[in-house]
């Protein structure tokens, strides 16, 4: 008799999830010599232990604590790049500007990027059929709690000038309900962080508006100012040229506004 299985509203665990996490860990430790001491089997065991045999709507930050310990890493606190709804460009930027880090440039972020996972209460099985959706099912699911935990810790670690890349093509350039708006903004430490500098990325080639005047950016400025952190904002009118100029800053066309 087939066992009854909870049907959730979200997609199930990414196929070959254990193999993917393990392979990513091995690859990361090979690329980053300072992490070569990491035991990837222990990392996988800690990751698995955070959600296996637990109800996927009852996951806590504490469940991920063993994984956090194994992911200990040096991140220059003044070289942190946050992003919201514009992940690809943020990652392209840090691939060129190698001294800056997004969360996904760390081991823990790299392991989980774009993956979905969940288990089932009282069984050691991974659920490949469905996982809880944050809105339709529950917020304390394995994926959401993981990203909330590492995002909070990443923001807490930041200092001096923190940069955030925002998508100027969206109706809400700053969205209070995004991970950046709901977690990271509120966990920047005013005693360590002097300024939050927003980079608003324009989508249209002919878009010359000053999106730093957008009402949602003004809302972000208000939230940040109330936390005793200074705020600044820059328009990136030409993201393609922006990346090109990061690669080749000596280029004569890079002195003009981008």
């Amino acid at each position: 008799v087939p066992r009854w299985r909870q049907q959730w509203s979200g997609p199930g665990t990414t196929k070959r999830f254990p193999e993917t996490v393990l392979a990513r860990c091995v690859k990361y430790t090979e690329i980053h010599p300072e992490m070569r001491h990491v035991d990837c089997q222990s990392v996988w065991d800690a990751f698995k232990g955070a959600f296996i045999s637990k109800h996927p709507c009852n996951i806590t930050e504490e469940d991920y604590q063993p994984l956090m310990k194994l992911g200990t890493q040096t991140v220059p606190c003044n070289k942190i790049l946050l992003w919201s709804r514009i992940k690809d460009l943020a990652h392209q930027f840090t691939q060129v500007q190698r001294d800056m880090f997004t969360l996904e440039d760390t081991l823990l972020g790299y392991l989980a990027d774009d993956l979905t996972w969940c288990g089932e209460f009282n069984t050691s099985k991974i659920n490949y059929q469905s996982c809880p959706d944050w809105r339709k099912d529950c917020s304390n699911n394995p994926v959401s709690v993981f990203w909330k935990t590492v995002s909070r810790r990443f923001a807490e670690a930041a200092c001096d000038v923190v940069h955030v890349m925002l998508n100027g093509s969206r109706s809400k350039i700053f969205d209070k309900n995004s991970t950046f708006g709901s977690v990271e903004v509120h966990n920047l430490q005013p005693e360590k962080v002097q300024t939050l500098e927003a980079w608003v990325i324009h989508g249209g080639r002919e878009d010359s508006r000053d999106l730093c005047q957008d009402p949602t950016i003004k809302e972000l400025e208000s939230i940040i100012s109330k936390r005793n952190i200074q705020f600044s904002c820059k328009n990136i009118y030409r993201p393609d040229k922006f990346l090109q100029c990061v690669k080749n800053p000596e280029d004569s066309s890079c002195t003009s506004e981008i």
Partner: nanobody
């Protein structure tokens, strides 16, 4: 600006003890969890222990549990790590850092602990 200065390291025989100190400045010390991390020669960064801002909550790596004790004196802006029953594998540079990790940017020079007979 967050600044820390670690001290108290040295050469000690296996089974011996040391007390490390970390003097912190540039921030409201009691508002921040603080951690000890270490780096053994030729190895990566390893988290050792964390203590909450008020000192009421502590956590330890399995490898040091029962042997090391973290504490703090908020009136002196100082963090401590008592190292007992030291082993050769505890040989490392010990750093204190603000926060609970896993992302650390240690600001001090660290203090070297060498366990050898």
């Amino acid at each position: 600006e967050v600044q820390v200065l670690e001290s108290g390291g040295g050469l000690v025989q296996p089974g011996g003890s040391l007390r490390l100190s970390c003097a912190a400045s540039g921030f409201t010390f009691s508002n921040f969890a603080m951690s000890w991390v270490r780096q053994a020669p030729g190895k990566g960064l390893e988290w050792v222990s964390t203590i909450s801002g008020g000192g009421g909550s502590t956590d330890y790596a399995d490898s040091v549990k029962g042997r090391f004790t973290i504490s703090r004196d908020n009136s002196k802006n100082t963090l401590y790590l008592q190292l007992n029953s030291l082993r050769a594998e505890d040989t490392a540079v010990y750093y204190c850092a603000d926060g609970r990790g896993p992302f650390f940017d240690y600001r001090g020079q660290g203090t070297l602990v060498t366990v050898s007979s």
